[in-house]
């Protein structure tokens, strides 16, 4: 449906509060280095303009596209060239190229200081003094650090952030009330950002067919009682929502997401019995709830798939008539029967089936050729099952920190060219799969583990794309979205890698080590571990364990000493010498 003024249409649909929040998020995700005040000024100007268009849709410039309006506004920033360099060249382009140019300059790893959490009283004072500015600051700080954060979901996080302060700043023990809530929001926010980043990578690098396949599999697991036509409609709508958000069209995205939530709640009976409690909630909470809803129960007595997908003489005819519909139905039927499989496994199975049909439907006797297609599925199913079993056993044996260290060693040996901070970040997150998934019942382990690993490995791919250093990483990241995890799992020690020269400075530590939090201490030790492996890629587990144990003992000893700095200065070189000897 066309509107005379797109900006007026979105302002009216979304309301002023959400409109302003989304415009702030959009601008902060594009211009990640701009100061807060600059963004607030731009947002206020856009909002005032939108109000004039609401009053009179035929007023000057009201007929312009949102990209044109927002792009023009971004290009008024005076310091664009100094702050962003070549991104300023985007402003010389016309739409739609200008928006594409802005999108390409989004930085997944912006050079921004880590967010420091002030004292609780300081935060509560700021919250009470100017609640609106306090919440805008939250949107701005999260959005600029996470340029692909799912914007309507970020509004939901901001609402929870507000609720936490409103409740806890009145509490007797403000800190005890507030800090766990902020920790939870931080951790959930990071997870939400990473999940959305995979959706955007899927759309941008592999196209909407890849995203639609992912969505068919996931929604069929969630809504196994829904008909294929219903799942297909939801997939089409969801693809539009995510395409818009990943493309920076945040107003359209939020509006369409609200429409999708409305549709789902109006059609619960043909979708899922689990939607009821979501549908009574206010909009932001409702959309979040629907996205996270648990899988509905599978219908009883679903027939074997062999009749329609192997035994039927019409398989090739049905496939040829509408390939994507036929494969979509295959994926739907398989996924609704297997909530115990990861989405990535289901997509591999569909891919294997597609490859078999491509080969067999051109053969002399197609039926004979594809008659045993499902025998090819068994190894595909058993590989992630075994991987989850082995890694959960290792996690239970080692605990999280040592499990992360095992993964750090494993991945550094596979791709030693990758920067140490990236290897530490990615391996630490890979290691979190244990605590997240291994405690779950067996039926939930594989979908939890493999789909989480896909999200973490996407972070490696995104960071590596910015600064490519390893052909093996490029290959695993670009060849096949669904085979990324198996591709990385299959990598062995890189024999071509020339070990990094030893640098004593890398292994020099100071008394400031003692004041670090437990997490920061772990990161320091894990950074040293990666550097050790880069120096001696063929070091054995036992050798590395010995060095790391000595390292922990050395740090503990010096942190107990009266003159800590003197201890580090004296014991440090001894530790380095002993480590070199142990790894020789």
């Amino acid at each position: 449906d066309t509107h005379k003024s797109e900006v007026a249409h979105r302002f009216k649909d979304l309301g002023e509060e959400h409109f302003k929040g989304l415009v702030l998020v959009a601008f902060s995700q594009y211009l990640q280095q701009c100061p807060f005040e600059e963004h607030v000024k731009l947002v206020n100007e856009v909002t005032e303009f939108a109000k004039t268009c609401v009053a009179d849709e035929s007023a000057e410039n009201c007929d312009k596209s949102l990209h044109t309006l927002f792009g023009d506004k971004l290009c008024t920033v005076a310091t664009l060239r100094e702050t962003y360099g070549e991104m300023a060249d985007c402003c010389a382009k016309q739409e739609p190229e200008r928006n594409e140019c802005f999108l390409q300059h989004k930085d997944d790893n912006p050079n921004l200081p880590p967010l420091v959490r002030p004292e609780v009283d300081v935060m509560c004072t700021a919250f009470h003094d100017n609640e609106a500015t306090f919440l805008k600051k939250y949107l701005y700080e999260v959005a600029r650090r996470h340029p692909y954060f799912y914007a309507p979901e970020l509004l939901f996080f901001a609402a929870r952030y507000k609720a936490a302060f409103a409740e806890c700043c009145q509490a007797a023990d403000k800190a005890a009330c507030l800090l766990p809530k902020l920790d939870e929001l931080r951790d959930e926010g990071k997870a939400s950002s990473a999940k959305q980043r995979l959706k955007c990578a899927s759309l941008q690098k592999f196209g909407d067919r890849a995203f639609k396949a992912w969505a068919v599999a996931r929604l069929s697991q969630k809504f196994p009682k829904a008909e294929f036509a219903e799942v297909s409609k939801l997939v089409t709508d969801l693809t539009k929502v995510h395409t818009e958000c990943c493309h920076g069209d945040l107003l359209e995205c939020a509006d369409d997401r609200a429409d999708l939530a409305k549709y789902m709640c109006e059609n619960q009976d043909s979708i899922s019995s689990k939607l009821k409690e979501c549908c009574d909630k206010p909009l932001l909470e409702k959309s979040h709830c629907l996205a996270e809803v648990e899988n509905d129960e599978m219908p009883a007595d679903l027939p074997s798939l062999a009749a329609d997908y192997v035994e039927s003489k019409d398989v090739c005819k049905n496939y040829a008539e509408a390939k994507d519909v036929f494969l979509g139905m295959f994926l739907y039927e398989y996924a609704r029967r297997h909530p115990d499989y990861s989405v990535m496994l289901l997509l591999r199975l569909a891919k294997a089936y597609e490859a078999t049909l491509e080969k067999c439907c051109a053969a002399a006797d197609p039926h004979e050729c594809y008659a045993k297609v499902f025998d090819e599925f068994q190894p595909l199913v058993e590989e992630p099952q075994n991987l989850v079993k082995q890694n959960c056993e290792l996690f239970e044996q080692l605990g999280e920190y040592k499990f992360q260290n095992a993964l750090l060693v494993r991945y550094t040996k596979k791709v030693p060219q990758v920067s140490t901070p990236t290897l530490v970040e990615v391996s630490r997150n890979l290691g979190k799969v244990g605590a997240k998934c291994c405690k779950l019942p067996e039926a939930k382990r594989m979908p939890c583990a493999e789909d989480y690993l896909s999200v973490v490995l996407n972070r490696l791919c995104v960071l590596h794309e910015k600064t490519p250093v390893s052909e093996k990483v490029t290959k695993c990241c670009t060849e096949s979205l669904v085979n990324r995890r198996p591709c990385f799992s299959a990598l062995e020690l890189d024999e071509a890698y020339v070990p990094k020269a030893f640098n004593a400075e890398t292994f020099t530590f100071h008394a400031d080590m003692c004041t670090l939090s437990e997490k920061e201490k772990q990161v320091k030790k894990q950074t040293a571990l990666v550097e050790l492996v880069k120096h001696k890629p063929k070091a054995t587990k036992e050798q590395l364990k010995g060095v790391m144990d000595n390292f922990a003992a050395f740090v503990e000893k010096c942190c107990k000493a009266d003159d800590k700095e003197a201890c580090f200065a004296e014991e440090g070189p001894k530790f380095v010498a002993a480590s070199q000897a142990a790894l020789a």
């Epitope: 697991q221 899988n295 129960e297 599978m298 009883a300 007595d301 679903l302 074997s304 798939l305 062999a306 192997v310 398989y334 029967r337 297997h338 909530p339 115990d340 499989y341 499902f374 599925f377 068994q378 199913v381 058993e382 019942p441 067996e442 039926a443 939930k444």
Partner: nanobody, 116 residues
């Protein structure tokens, strides 16, 4: 195909407990739903309890709160823990496997008799 073998049946007094096991072999990778059915003399075969691939369970009203179904995918076994048994629970108990790629499979059955 999937092959199923039940064990654990026997004679038990009212109020007692029994634990039935079903060992699956063959193409177990393709199983989605496992279930226990029972057939009393002269009656039709009825569902007792079902557990899906996602772990969700469903029980016949007559056994709710007394019977518990569980599955161990690693060991390929289905278990039915039966407590507070009643004479009307007397029947032949059959293990059932629904497969994604193969026809459904039934075990041979194991007799459960509840009598004082």
């Amino acid at each position: 195909q999937v092959q199923l073998v039940e064990s654990g049946g026997g004679l038990v007094q009212p109020g007692g407990s029994l634990r039935l096991s079903c060992a699956a072999s063959g193409s177990t990778w393709s199983i989605n739903t496992l279930a226990w059915y029972r057939q009393a003399p002269g009656k039709q075969r009825d569902l007792v309890a079902r557990i899906s691939s996602g772990g969700s369970t469903h029980y016949a009203d007559s056994v709710k709160g007394r019977f518990t179904v569980s599955r161990d995918n690693a060991e390929n076994t289905l278990v039915l823990q039966m407590n507070s048994l009643k004479p009307e629970d007397t029947a032949v108990y059959y293990c059932y496997a629904q497969s994604t790629w193969y026809p459904p499979s039934w075990g041979q059955g194991t007799q459960v008799t509840v009598s004082s």
